[in-house]
Interface confidence: medium
Amino acid sequence: LECYSCVQKADDGCSPNKMKTVKCAPGVDVCTEAVGAVETIHGQFSLAVRGCGSGLPGKNDRGLDLHGLLAFIQLQQCAQDRCNAKLNLTSRALDPAGNESAYPPNGVECYSCVGLSREACQGTSPPVVSCYNASDHVYKGCFDGNVTLTAANVTVSLPVRGCVQDEFCTRDGVTGPGFTLSGSCCQGSRCNSDLRNKTYFSPRIPPLVRLPPPEPTTVASTTSVTTSTSAPVRPTSTTKPMPAPTSQTPRQGVEHEASRDEEPRLTGGAAGHQDRSNSGQYPAKGGPQQPHNKGC
C-alpha cells in the first residue's frame, strides 16, 4: 500500500506541494489522515497527519468544547493507494478571529498562543490579547495547555493559550479520536504564563479552617464548615461533545478546484462561537472546497 505522508503543525506542512508518498510496511492495509483544529476567540490553527495507518477504514468526526475553546477533529482511514488526501485543509479565515471589534473588552488580558511553537509560547513572551464576552458567554479566565494529535505512528503537539469561560479549571481536558486538548485555567490578567504545575486548590475552594474548640456555654452553631483532605470535586465541566460537520471532498482529477488555506476549514461552528464565525462569508458544506497546493 502507498499512502501520502505529511505532518502539519499550524504551518503549511501538509500543503500539496509538500506532499510525499510512502510505501507502507507489509501487513499495513490502511492509509490514514487526521486533522485537529483548535479555535479560540482570537484565532484558530490546526494539526494534521497523513501516513500509513492501522485499524479499519472509516471516518470519525467530532467537535469538542473545553471552556469555550473549540476543537474539531476529523479522522479518515481508507484502503486504497494514496487515498488519504480527502480531508479539506482549507481555513475559514477568521476576521481577525471573527467580528472581535463588535465586542468590547471585558477588562481581562491573557497570553495568547494560537499556532505558536513551543519556543514562541514560553512564559511571558507570547502576545497579549484582550478578552471579550461572546454569544452570551463570559470569557474572563485565561488558559494554558496543549493540543496533541496522534495518527500514523506520529504524535504532534502544540501549546494553546487564550481566553476561556472558566477561571479555575485544573488539568482539564477533552479527547477525540487520537486527539487531546488539555490544560488549566486561571483568574486575573496575564495569569496564564505557566500553569503546568497548577494544583487543584483554587480561590473557589474554601480553605481548610481549624475551628476553635466550642465554648461550653455556646449553643450549637448553625454554621457548618466542610473540610476535606481529598481533592475537591470541581464544578461541572462545560466540556461537551459537539457534532463536527464533515468537509469530505473525494479526491478527483485536477479539474476539481483545489487549494487550501493555512488550517483546515471545518465548516460550521459550534454553539457559543456563532457570533464570531463569520459563517455567512464562507461556502457552506458541499461548496467549493479546495485542498491547497502552494506549489508546482
Epitope: P16, T90, V254, S259, E262, H292, N293, C296
Partner: antibody
Framework: EVQLLESGGGLVQPGGSLRLSCAAS????????MSWVRQAPGKGLEWVSY????????YYADSVKGRFTISRDNSKNTLYLQMNSLRAEDTAVYYC??????????WGQGTLVTVSS | QSVLTQPPSASGTPGQRVTISCSGS?????????VHWYQQLPGTAPKLLIY???QRPSGVPDRFSGSKSGTSASLAISGLRSEDEADYYC???????????FGGGTKLTVL
C-alpha cells in the same frame, strides 16, 4: 473554466517599480491559493511567490524577497504583485497561476516585464 | 542552474515513443515529494500535463504518462504527434530550499 488575465507589465528602468494585476474568473477565487511564476526570455520557469486564500500567508523566492510583495483583493477577484527595486534580471514574462490539487492547474497568458535603461 | 535536471532537448518521429527524464536529489524527488509535468506550446502559457507523479488531468490524452523512481522521474509520450512539439518542465517541492522548483525544461522536436 479557470480564466486568469494578467496586466500591468511594461518597460521600466532599473530601480523602478511596477504593479502587476491578475483578474480571475471561472472559479471561487477566495478559496484558492495563488502564485506568480516567471519566465525570462528563452529560459525556464521560475516560481516567484504565492499567497494563501485569505491573504494572511505569503511566501517568496529568495531572489525577490524584500523587493516584491504579493497581495490579493478577494472582493475584486484580483491578485497583485508589487515589484520594487527592479533589476535587469527581473525581465521576464510573469504568469499568474492558480494552485490546484497538487499542482498549478490554471495559468494566465502572462505579461511581459522589461527592466532596462 | 536548475535544481531538477532535464535534458535540454529530445526528438522523435511521429508515432514513436519518447521519454523525458527529470533528475533530482534527496531533498526533492528523493525525499518523496510528488512530481508534476507541464507542457508549454510555442508562444503560449504552460499547461498542467501530469500531476502527483502519474495522474492525468481531464482532457490530457492517455498517450502521456508519468513515473517516478528514487530521485528521478520521467515523462513518456507514446504515439508522438506533431502537436506534441513543445517545451516540457518537471516540478517538485524542495526541502532544503523550502520552495517549489522546476526543471530547466526539455524542448521536444517532432521530426
Amino acid at each position: 473554466e479557470v480564466q486568469l488575465l494578467e496586466s500591468g507589465g511594461g518597460l521600466v528602468q532599473p530601480g523602478g517599480s511596477l504593479r502587476l494585476s491578475c483578474a480571475a474568473s471561472g472559479f471561487t477565487f477566495s478559496s484558492a491559493w495563488m502564485s506568480w511564476v516567471r519566465q525570462a526570455p528563452g529560459k525556464g520557469l521560475e516560481w516567484v511567490s504565492y499567497i494563501s486564500s485569505s491573504g494572511s500567508s505569503t511566501y517568496y523566492a529568495d531572489s525577490v524577497k524584500g523587493r516584491f510583495t504579493i497581495s490579493r483583493d478577494n472582493s475584486k477577484n484580483t491578485l497583485y504583485l508589487q515589484m520594487n527595486s527592479l533589476r535587469a534580471e527581473d525581465t521576464a514574462v510573469y504568469y499568474c497561476a492558480r494552485e490546484g490539487l497538487w499542482a498549478f492547474d490554471g495559468w494566465g497568458q502572462g505579461t511581459l516585464v522589461t527592466v532596462s535603461s | 542552474q536548475s535544481v531538477l535536471t532535464q535534458p535540454p532537448s529530445a526528438s522523435g518521429t511521429p508515432g514513436q515513443r519518447v521519454t523525458i527524464s527529470c533528475s533530482g536529489s534527496s531533498s526533492n524527488i528523493g525525499a518523496g515529494y510528488v512530481v508534476h509535468w507541464y507542457q508549454q506550446l510555442p508562444g503560449t502559457a504552460p499547461k498542467l500535463l501530469i500531476y502527483d507523479n502519474n495522474q492525468r488531468p481531464s482532457g490530457v490524452p492517455d498517450r502521456f504518462s508519468g513515473s517516478k523512481s528514487g530521485t528521478s522521474a520521467s515523462l513518456a509520450i507514446s504515439g508522438l504527434r506533431s502537436e506534441d512539439e513543445a517545451d516540457y518542465y518537471c516540478a517538485a517541492y524542495d526541502d532544503s530550499l523550502n520552495r517549489p522548483v522546476f526543471g530547466g525544461g526539455t524542448k521536444l522536436t517532432v521530426l
